[in-house]
């Protein structure tokens, strides 16, 4: 009779991360009688998978009954596979011996490969805000993914973007990897409402790329443009200027009337109206009783907007002439106001 | 295909440096360790130790304690064999040789191996 | 260290002969072996692993057998391109450790 051959049928296995692994194993015949051992490699630092004979093994589970007489097949199933468990395990036959049972054939070994979902993407932006025309960067990261082979893109507002830099940790053969990019992306005024999209690809992922987001909001500043007009009111002696806030994302915006450089009142944007492309609009105003002054005065609006150095506009009110309007505003404007009598 | 390429041979004083390369292309250098085995010259082979590619940790045989020492530049997929203070003993062929495992964690036998370098230690 | 002794230094042969090369280790490695073949100037070349597993693209004129301590590489049918060094190899334990080597010639 010809010798025991130990047949594993597959040189490679994979396997999703999660799931579980059967390694096929047949013995060509029952003789010499003698249990069989799983390893995980070979060399002095191979590590035993499964004993038929002896020991506690709660993630494998043998293919056929190995109680039987008969039986030829040494097929085991090991469960819940993480990418750990790569490497080429090897089926050996162990012949009855005493004291102790002697190693007599292994198989050719199968090599085990584990796929593993990415993680989702994580996007981060810059820590502190940028303005329209700056460059900022995002970085977006993904972990615990295999095999290597991976696909990263970005996008703002669905249009792809070209700027960016990708590496995959570690460089050689891991378990798993991670993923790591940086992406530059220009500021323009309209991006309160833009968002920054990180897509990756995988094998694991059977063309549903996972996604990674972030909110331009949450990165742009846009500045405000100031405009100061006076109109006449109903009493000839008192003037109305108006400070209009225009186009400033986000919301934190405090103001200060200034006349010949004393303040005369700060107050805070609360009630704000909302421009389509998510910036915002305020106005505020100033009812000065040019009757009490003597000389011209200058009014100055001064907006410092989320916590950046000051800007200002100011206007000059001449007292000797009868004013002029100057500019037209609607009420639904006036979502501020200040009155200020001057004697 | 999978290739060990070995830097070429070297003709040292005793009490010298010698760093020889094994430059390793066609497969995934950190996935599988590598060894170091002697030849002195009409004698027989002599494992030296490994490196693990992936970790960078290093085993040497107890014979080769001390004065020999293995090194990585993954990036240019490269194992590197350095020998200090030679002596005329050193004089002899040295193979890189590839393990047969992914990830394994212990050489075991070698299915690839560099062409060698001899490595000549004379005054 | 387990010694592996290869007691035959060199063994002359003829072409289409059938060839024995023993391998004796100084403690059991199981079948822990793998055979190499060098030729002169060369690099060695891996035949057998697992003491009876023939590595890929390696004629099937090669057949290893053994286990414990006893272990032979066998050529059945002789060939010219045969001539050569074959030395057992065992990775039991460390250090790893190679036989001396036995040297095929044509008598």
């Known amino acids: 009779e010809e010798e025991l051959q130990v047949i594993q049928p597959d040189k490679s296995v994979l396997v999703a991360a999660g799931e579980t692994a059967t390694l096929r194993c047949t013995a060509t015949s029952l003789i010499p009688v003698g249990p069989i051992q799983w390893f995980r490699g070979a060399g002095p630092g191979r590590e035993l998978i499964y004993n038929q004979k002896e020991g506690h093994f709660p993630r494998v589970t043998t293919v056929s009954d190995l109680t039987k007489r008969n039986n030829m097949d040494f097929s085991i199933r090991i469960g819940n596979i993480t990418p750990a468990d790569a490497g080429t395990y090897y089926c050996v036959k162990f012949r009855k011996g005493s004291p102790d049972d002697v190693e007599f054939k292994s198989g050719a070994g199968t090599e085990l490969s584990v796929r593993a979902k990415p993680s989702a993407p994580v996007v981060s932006g810059p820590a502190a805000r940028a303005t329209p025309q700056h460059t900022v960067s995002f970085t977006c990261e993904s972990h615990g993914f295999s095999p290597r082979d991976i696909t990263l893109k970005w996008f703002k507002n669905g249009n792809e973007l070209s700027d960016f830099q990708t590496n995959v940790d570690p460089v050689g053969e891991s378990v798993s990897y991670s993923i790591h990019s940086t992406a530059k992306v220009v500021l323009t005024r309209e991006d309160v409402h833009s968002q920054v999209i990180c897509e990756v690809a995988h094998v694991t992922l059977q063309g549903d790329p996972l996604r990674g987001t972030a909110n331009l909001s949450e990165t742009i500043r846009v500045p405000p443009t100031l405009e100061v007009t006076q109109q006449p009111v109903r009493a000839e002696n008192q003037v109305n200027v108006t400070c209009q806030v225009r186009k400033f994302y986000p919301q934190r915006l405090q103001l200060t009337w200034l006349e010949n450089g004393n303040v005369s009142r700060t107050e805070t944007a609360s009630t704000v109206t909302e421009n389509k492309d998510g910036t915002y609009n305020w106005m505020s105003w100033l009812l000065v009783n040019v009757s009490a002054h003597r000389d011209d005065v200058k009014l100055t609006c001064q907006v410092e907007h989320d916590g950046q150095p000051a800007v200002s506009k100011s206007h000059d009110l001449k007292v000797s002439a009868h004013p002029k309007e100057q500019g037209s505003n609607t009420a639904a404007e006036n979502t501020g106001s200040n009155e200020r009598n001057i004697y | 295909q999978i290739q060990l390429v070995q830097s070429g041979p070297e003709l040292k004083k005793p009490g010298e440096t010698v760093k020889i390369s094994c430059r390793a292309s066609?497969?995934?250098?950190?996935?599988?360790?590598m060894s170091w085995v002697k030849q002195a010259p009409g004698k027989g082979l002599r494992w030296m130790g490994w490196?693990?590619?992936?970790?960078?940790?290093?085993t040497c045989a107890d014979d080769f304690k001390g004065r020999f020492a293995f090194s990585l530049e993954t990036s240019a997929t490269t194992a590197y064999l350095q020998i200090h203070n030679l002596t005329n003993e050193d004089t002899a062929t040295y193979f890189c040789?590839?393990?047969?495992?992914?990830?394994?964690?212990?050489?075991?036998?070698?299915?690839?191996w560099g062409q060698g370098t001899l490595v000549t230690v004379s005054a | 260290d387990i010694v592996m002794t290869q007691s035959q230094k060199f063994m002359s042969t003829t072409i289409r002969d059938r060839v024995s090369i023993t391998c004796k280790a100084s403690?059991?490695?199981?079948?822990?072996v793998a055979w190499y073949q060098q030729k002169s100037g060369q690099s060695p070349k891996l035949l057998i692993y697992?003491?009876?597993n023939r590595y890929t693209g390696v004629p099937d004129r090669f057949t290893g057998s053994g286990s414990g301590t006893d272990f032979t590489l066998t050529i059945s049918n002789m060939q010219s391109e045969d001539l050569a060094d074959y030395f057992c190899?065992?990775?039991?334990?460390?250090?790893?450790?190679f036989g001396s080597g036995t040297k095929l010639a044509i008598k």
């Open positions: 490196i693990n590619t992936y970790s960078g940790v290093s």
């Open positions: 403690q059991n490695v199981g079948i822990s």
């Open positions: 697992s003491a009876s």
């Open positions: 066609g497969y995934t250098f950190t996935t599988y360790g």
């Open positions: 190899q065992q990775y039991s334990s460390y250090p790893l450790t």
């Open positions: 040789a590839r393990d047969p495992h992914s990830y394994g964690n212990s050489p075991a036998w070698f299915p690839y």
